[in-house]
């Protein structure tokens, strides 16, 4: 007659007489004169099917009413809620002695769902039910009715189902509602783990251990477990799940991070707004994409802002000291949003005639404190060549410079080292030897260290051992030494001079003049 009624989530109804459409049609014994199915009107003028008996005149009443078969549905313990009205015997004059104010509740387990008769001896008594003072006042047909509610439980049950029976022993009673239910711990999500509907144990004190499964888009941190208590309440949650990267907990679910938010790891944190200079265009981002021109270093956390390479250093000053240069500069105007700024020095040696033709300086040049990864804004460069054009670039770098090597990041200066005494001449040759002369030629020093103003040739007879020598000066890289004695060994040294002075003499070249008037042409250092 009435639709499904709403009961607590932890109760599963197996029978509800108030929800049965039409007549209940339970079995009564005796068939006549005992329990009778009667419709009464509730507060909404809707008929309620009740069972009534009021045989208060005769002694030794034994009126039975049996429900239809009730499936157990796997429950081991069931609860019977009876709402009933019991008439006070005092309101029925002349029935003292025969009128009772209790009835008895029985059950019988059976696998047979079609037992047609009541066999009283098969039934097991659950309890004697009496009206107590804890009644509820309910409107029935525009008047207040005292409605008693009694709940009993029975178990453990093992067969497929069971029957309930009500034995009247002479009361004036109406069964207004009979509800049979079992308790379960309802499907729930706790600590992001889902625990299924779980039927309570057979015992009123038993706990059923249940393992939970992580909700979608989450993973176990510790094994999630809970215990289902006999009253249908979940107890003692242990362990938990964490939302995967790109997801956060919302309403007991792991939901994707919204656009503009991200979450990098499986943690219990919420999604965070994308850091400065980054964005996410999809839901469920585990990191945010850097804006154009901004980057994230390999070891930068996803939570760090995207950064960019620094701008060029400022105010580069050079100070040349002979073949050393001291450079100083200021930090860049824009560090790119990073703290890990450092500086690299690039040294290029450039031709005097064409400054665009530059080559790396090579390993002979030394840098103090170092060439790369400088943390200070100064460097000293030594062991340069004198009188040479050098271009020095100071590069400002940070953790993301490698992603965008932009020339704007460096500042450069071109200097020329001071002139110095030239290096020694590596190779001196006797080109022509006669009885009285020697024609010499040589190469420019490896390091002229300036403009070669002249070359000086020193020579002496070998046996004089430099006690008496002569000097010849020439601007050319060759000269004829005349007025020599025939058949005599001479030693020749050549050195170059710049404005800064003379360089070292070359290694000695020993040459012996001829005895005959013929010419000998040689290129060795020890012509004879």
């Amino acid at each position: 007659v009435t639709g499904s009624r709403v009961y607590p989530a932890n109760e599963v109804t197996l029978l509800d007489s108030r929800s049965v459409q039409g007549e209940l049609g339970w079995i009564a014994s005796p068939l006549e004169g005992g329990w009778e199915e009667v419709s009464i009107m509730d507060e909404k003028n809707t008929p309620i099917r009740t069972y009534q008996v009021c045989n208060v005149m005769e002694p030794s009443q034994n009126n039975w009413l049996r429900t239809d078969w009730i499936t157990r549905e796997g429950a081991q313990r069931v609860y019977i809620e009876i709402k009933f009205t019991l008439r006070d015997c005092n309101s029925l004059p002349g029935v003292m002695g025969t009128c009772k104010e209790t009835f008895n509740l029985y059950y019988y387990e059976s696998d047979n769902d079609k037992e047609r008769f009541i066999r009283e001896n098969q039934f097991v008594k659950i309890d004697t039910i009496a009206a107590d003072e804890s009644f509820t006042q309910v409107d029935i047909g525009d008047r207040i009715m005292k409605l008693n509610t009694e709940i009993r439980d029975v178990g453990p049950l093992s067969k497929k189902g069971f029957y309930l029976a009500f034995q009247d022993v002479g009361a004036c009673i109406a069964l207004v509602s009979v509800r049979v239910f079992y308790k379960k711990c309802p499907l729930t999500v706790r600590n992001l783990a889902q625990f299924p509907d779980t039927i309570t144990g057979a015992d009123t004190s038993s706990l059923v251990e249940v393992r939970g499964s992580c909700v979608n888009n989450s993973e176990e941190k510790d094994v999630p477990k809970m215990y289902c208590g006999a009253d249908g309440e979940w107890l003692v949650p242990i362990g938990n799940c964490l939302c995967n990267a790109g997801h956060e907990e919302r309403s007991g679910e792991c939901q994707a991070c919204k656009i503009g938010y991200y979450k990098a790891l499986s943690t219990d944190a919420t999604c965070a707004k994308c850091p400065p200079h980054s964005y996410s265009v999809w839901e469920g981002a585990t990191s945010c994409t850097c804006d154009r021109g901004f980057f994230r270093a390999d070891n930068d956390a996803a939570s760090m802002p995207c950064t960019r390479p620094p701008s060029a250093p400022l105010n580069l000053i050079s100070n040349v000291n002979e073949t050393s240069v001291n450079l100083e500069w200021s930090s860049p105007q824009n560090t790119g949003g990073r703290q890990d700024i450092s500086y690299n020095v690039v040294c290029k040696k450039c031709g005097a005639g064409d400054p665009s033709k530059c080559r790396p300086c090579g390993s002979g040049v030394h840098y103090t404190p170092q060439q790369n990864g400088l943390k200070t804004t100064k460097v000293s460069i030594t062991d340069l060549l004198a009188h040479t054009n050098y271009t020095f670039e100071i590069w400002a770098v940070n953790g993301v410079s490698k992603y965008n090597p932009n020339p704007d990041q460096s500042v450069s200066v071109t200097v020329t080292t001071n002139q110095a005494a030239p290096s020694s001449i590596a190779l001196v040759q006797a080109k022509e030897v006669t009885r009285y002369s020697v024609a010499l030629a040589w190469l420019e020093p490896d390091r002229p260290n300036g403009v070669i103003l002249e070359y000086e040739v020193k020579y002496y007879e070998k046996d004089q051992n430099e006690r008496s020598y002569r000097i010849v000066r020439t601007a050319a890289r060759n000269t004829d030494i005349k007025g020599l004695n025939p058949l005599t060994s001479y030693v020749f040294h050549v050195r170059a001079r710049t404005a800064a002075g003379y360089g070292d003499f070359s290694e000695p070249l020993e040459v012996t003049t001829n005895t005959v008037p013929s010419r000998i042409i040689g290129d060795g250092a020890n012509s004879t």
């Epitope: 004169g33 009464i40 009107m41 009534q52 009021c54 005149m57 009205t85 002349g94 525009d142």
Partner: antibody, heavy 121, light 106 residues
Framework: QVQLLQSGAEVKKPGASVKVPCKAS????????MSWVRQAPGQGLEWMGW????????TYAQGFTGRFVFSLDTSVSTAYLQISSLKAEDTAVYYC??????????????WGQGTLVTVSS | EIVLTQSPATLSVSPGERATLSCRAS??????PAWYQQKPGQAPRLLIY???TRATGIPDRFSASGSGTDFTLTISRVEPEDFAVYYC????????FGQGTKVEIK
């Protein structure tokens, strides 16, 4: 089928007595109380009282004590109303009616056809 | 003793119309009264008893309601066989009837 059968009309002189039988059939006589109701000509119904058919214990309404007696013979499932010292104002139809007790209230669910008792000199 | 007063004494209705009969108690009663129908020359017939329950064979156009001291019998659509006298009856340690309402054809 449940019925209550009453005797035919009675004409009595003032001061006389009358015993009106009500025979029950179709149910267990001792399981239901029996009530008596009077209806004077052209008047409404008056409840006279009832008798516990199991114990024989009667209950009389105000105004129906003394001259009115309810009795039983359970062996023949019959209830009796005896009126003594009849008066002209006792002229009425007398009904027996089976009482139905319920949790929610009582009523008389089966009625006899009534016995007209006329008191006239 | 509780006195029941019925009104109106006579109610004129046409077949198919709704009829509403009133029964007022001299003091508050805990239960709804029973209602009876009596046609001329016949014994009364129980219509409705405890908690507004219709007696066996009574059509559902008859219904009863009320609480405390004011009670009502309603015939939703009067049929020709419904023209009769109607009595309310209060029960308890002592039972009393109302004086009756006659429902007649308009």
């Amino acid at each position: 089928q449940v019925q209550l059968l009453q005797s035919g009309a009675e004409v009595k002189k003032p001061g006389a007595s009358v015993k009106v039988p009500c025979k029950a059939s179709g149910y267990t006589f001792t399981s239901r109380a029996m009530s008596w109701v009077r209806q004077a000509p052209g008047q409404g119904l008056e409840w006279m009282g009832w008798i516990n058919t199991n114990t024989g214990n009667p209950t009389y309404a105000q105004g129906f004590t003394g001259r009115f007696v309810f009795s039983l013979d359970t062996s023949v499932s019959t209830a009796y109303l005896q009126i003594s010292s009849l008066k002209a104002e006792d002229t009425a139809v007398y009904y027996c009616a089976r009482v139905r007790f319920t949790v929610y209230g009582d009523g008389m669910d089966v009625w006899g056809q009534g016995t007209l008792v006329t008191v006239s000199s | 003793e509780i006195v029941l007063t019925q009104s109106p004494a006579t109610l004129s209705v046409s077949p198919g119309e709704r009829a509403t009969l009133s029964c007022r108690a001299s003091q508050s009663v805990s239960s709804n009264p029973a209602w009876y129908q009596q046609k001329p020359g016949q014994a009364p017939r129980l219509l409705i008893y405890g908690a507004s329950t219709r007696a066996t064979g009574i059509p559902d156009r008859f219904s009863a309601s009320g609480s405390g001291t004011d009670f009502t019998l309603t015939i939703s659509r009067v049929e020709p066989e419904d023209f009769a006298v109607y009595y309310c009856q209060q029960y308890g340690p002592s039972w009393t009837f109302g004086q009756g309402t006659k429902v007649e054809i308009k």
